[in-house]
Interface confidence: medium
Amino acid sequence: QSPTPSPTGLTTAKMPSVPLSSDPLPTHTTAFSPASTFERENDFSETTTSLSPDNTSTQVSPDSLDNASAFNTTGVSSVQTPHLPTHADSQTPSAGTDTQTFSGSAANAKLNPTPGSNAISDVPGERSTASTFPTDPVSPLTTTLSLAHHSSAALPARTSNTTITANTSDAYLNASETTTLSPSGSAVISTTTIATTPSKPTCDEKYANITVDYLYNKETKLFTAKLNVNENVECGNNTCTNNEVHNLTECKNASVSISHNSCTAPDKTLILDVPPGVEKFQLHDCTQVEKADTTICLKWKNIETFTCDTQNITYRFQCGNMIFDNKEIKLENLEPEHEYKCDSEILYNNHKFTNASKIIKTDFGSPGEPQIIFCRSEAAHQGVITWNPPQRSFHNFTLCYIKETEKDCLNLDKNLIKYDLQNLKPYTKYVLSLHAYIIAKVQRNGSAAMCHFTTKSAPPSQVWNMTVSMTSDNSMHVKCRPPRDRNGPHERYHLEVEAGNTLVRNESHKNCDFRVKDLQYSTDYTFKAYFHNGDYPGEPFILHHSTSYNSK
């Protein structure tokens, strides 16, 4: 089954997820993997290089690249498809003669797959197709895995330990190198010294960009730094055993002097810049519930204080094939009810020291619009509406009907597809709106479908406030007020005048205002006034009145 694309180019968690780092998790470590092997420039190494005057240049590999692309995502940003790098473009390692910096603020060096890797190679040989962040084969961002000169082998199994890798490139390249893969799949260089090998490098050269893995012990809250070298090096003051420096406190610098019989003085002075403890960071879901159906917000929170410089901490996220380097990300225009996997990692001085993954299911979305089949009135006081339900999940319907300015709403069971409206007012236009809703993290209403009908006519109500007054001996003036409910299309007032059982007058006016003349004197009359709406007559209002004797 193919993954479901969202409007942002994310894919749902049904597809294989793309880890941030290329190496597998070491056995029995708790949650965090070593960072993938990146070729790095000297300025990104875990080192401060101190060189003697005789060592002022660095042999570099001459096959240069001049291709690069930079990601640009700043702030808490919405998803954009990033420009993908074709090659990592790290610069030549320097043994100290030249200085490398980034211009501008940290934000200008965004989302380099590894620090320095978006700097176009400007020296021969640094065609570093290093593992761009990430290198899982399913990722669209995958670049060819290079057998880097300094790839980290898988770390030994450690219970309750976290592996953190600080990778930089090996400054010194021997004349003859054999590249092999270690059991972990990482590249390892074994060097074979042959007649053409140059004279021994200084240890400062040889280990100029030694890579360091930091192992965090959650119980002791101390780090161990593992020096990624192929030979068992010696450390000044015996500070390391088996290429490991133990009991390092978070956020403290430690200086280690490294030497080996394969290299000459000066020794390599390695400054270990120890990261903060991993448990001081927590990945928090900051999604607003109102928007949880189409957005995801993730934010790293510092839940404890530490003394490391926070400016040296950078954050990376990968959700699907989208990559960001913000502390907080907001993904928008997602599909409701879909799972999205986001991997994140935190780097200290551009070296990963912790990561986390979250699978977030977006909330139920607003239901779709119901499809009204018909709505009509077949009687004066009744109406009917039938519909097809929307496709998406919902809990119930709300049916509202509006006459003039009055509005009534009903909650209807989700299984209903028809509703009979009762006690409607005759000959009245009703506007109906029907929407489905779902109660998720918040109630979400679907779009309303609208229809209208006019109820059938019915007899109007009685006229009221009828008066009969004598205007002369034989003339009467009959007036009344309109009915409260006309209940039909037309307006006509009727007056019937009876004497005994005989209809003596039958008049019809637009207004209820009748002047009845030439009546018999001294006679009892019955006056019946009623309203006719074009379809039905109303109940008559009846008054009795007598003419008087003629005054003459």
Partner: antibody
Amino acid sequence: QVQLQQSGAELARPGASVKMSCKASGYTFTSYTMQWVKQRPGQGLEWIGYINPSSGYIKYNQKFKDKVTLTADKSSTTAYMQLSRLTSEDSAVYYCARRGSYFFDFWGQGTSVTVSS
Amino acid sequence: DIVITQDELSNPVTSGESVSISCRSSKSLLYKDGKTYLNWFLQRPGQSPQLLIYLMSTRASGVSDRFSGSGSGTDFTLEISRVKAEDVGVYYCQQLVEYPFTFGGGTKLEVK
């Protein structure tokens, strides 16, 4: 066609700073590094350093690292070099040059800087 | 730093003759990929440098076949056959194998 257009000549006093520009056109600015080279009157060429406009990554010749600041503006496809604390030693023509795979293939016309009190 | 040395030409060259310009590196510019990272430039009077030869012997686009480069890891020669008046200027060699990149001091060619 590829062109590198450098800003005009500068006359500055000792101790001052100057900032020159190199406007690139005719190619994708972010796909090549921009190199800077110094040539003192009647003398040879000296490599100052370069900037990768794509990432902002800079590498300096150690000799110039306290003298020069390189920047680039992707939106205007322009690279800049600022010289600070000028002395008479800084009087020279400064070239920007695009770096191809194995060579500096296109050069600007040069910006002349004269430091004089 | 790698030091690049260029010799001066003692006399102006007659138009139509051939001339060799030498360049020596303090360190081999042959890298393990088999390429030699030595480039030649010509800077005509009042102009910017122009690339002639790269990787020791490959002519740059648009450069006359009268120009050819050769050499070993440390000793290099730029050969100009049938010299023309337009060939006057200063010829520089440059190494790109190691930072900082360095140029030779230049060889001035005069044509009579």
